[in-house]
Amino acid sequence: LQDPCSNCPAGTFCDNNRNQICSPCPPNSFSSAGGQRTCDICRQCKGVFRTRKECSSTSNAECDCTPGFHCLGAGCSMCEQDCKQGQELTKKGCKDCCFGTFNDQKRGICRPWTNCSLDGKSVLVNGTKERDVVCGPSPADLSPGASSVTPPAPAREPGHSPQ
């Protein structure tokens, strides 16, 4: 025998109190699949969380973070404070990157400058707290007898901190 509740579409629930009639989800609740016996309570975006997408009867609300914060975790389960470029977030708040490291984003950690000499190249542009060094041609390429100059290698693509 087919379960009568299987006929209830998303956005409704199978109401046992009313002879298994498909009743609409009440306000602030949803069912994203058919055949549900209850509707789930919608997520509330409170405090540092901000509503990005309101709950509908078939889909949960989605939150993001208020200005000055960014999302972390699956489905933006946490909001983490932004820092300025050239800083990283520590337990004591935002701290400047130490000499020899940089951060070109408002999130994530300070990372060491690229070591140009490991690739046999010279430093074309010095690094800062906000920017990586730019490596230039190798010293051999700059010798008087060299007929051409190889284009500078692109700066290393910065990694992204986990979302």
Epitope: P27, N28, K53, E54, S56, T58
Partner: antibody, heavy 116, light 107 residues
């Protein structure tokens, strides 16, 4: 910034129908409910119904089920309310307002006058 | 439908005074109540959501309290711009309903 733009006034004859508009801007139209609220002169607010532009979910106040039809045009980020078989009792200010539960942004309202 | 009763219909106060508005629901609605004010010829504006949660951009003199069936909106020191109509609204069940409103007027 979030804005809901409504025409200032509509004049229609008894028995006719009218389609009121509410153009949304400053946010993702498909992510937030649009509600419609009626207010007769000197009277309280009366909730007509709402629509979720992302999937056309609607909820209606039973008093307006045969009177009002809510639709949206996603391409222009505009919500509409069609009112049929108009009588003098339908003369009122009609507001559109954004929100799933609490209504956080409101249009300026359209004054509908039903008169011969 | 859930009936919201607001009392009194009219409140007369002087600027600087504290004032409280009452909203009573016909059944238990938890904290699913929201408060608005509406100035003459203006649109309603959300003041408090979910009984007590503040709204960005709304002055801190507005506060809300209550749960179940009895709710209160308070203004701790009324300013001239606060003289308006005040409405409560429930979002506990369809259809959403509004209270009949309380008019705040200058004494």
């Amino acid at each position: 910034q979030v804005q809901l733009q409504q025409p200032g006034a509509e004049l229609v004859k008894p028995g006719a129908s009218v389609k009121l508009s509410c153009k949304a801007s400053g946010y993702t139209f498909t992510n937030f409910w649009i509600n419609w609220v009626k207010q007769r002169p000197g009277q309280a607010l009366e909730w007509i119904g709402n629509i979720y532009p992302g999937n056309d979910n609607t909820n209606y106040n039973g008093n307006f089920k045969t009177k009002a039809t809510l639709t949206v045009d996603r391409s222009s980020s505009t919500a509409y309310m069609h009112l049929s078989s108009l009588t003098s009792k339908d003369s009122a200010v009609y507001y559109c307002a954004r929100g799933q539960l609490g209504l956080d942004y409101w249009g300026q309202g359209t004054t509908l006058t039903v008169s011969s | 439908d859930i009936l919201l009763t607001q009392s009194p219909a009219i409140l007369s106060v002087s600027p600087g005074e504290r004032v409280s508005f009452s909203c009573r629901a016909s059944q238990n609605i938890g904290t699913t109540i929201h408060w608005y004010h509406q100035r003459t010829n203006g649109s309603p504006r959300l003041l408090i959501k979910f009984a007590s949660e503040s709204i960005s951009g709304i002055p801190s003199r507005f506060s809300g309290s209550g749960s179940g069936t009895d709710f209160t909106l308070s203004i701790n020191s009324v300013e001239s711009e606060d003289f308006a109509d005040y409405y409560c609204q429930q979002s506990n069940s369809w259809p959403f309903t509004f209270g009949s409103g309380t008019k705040l007027e200058i004494k």
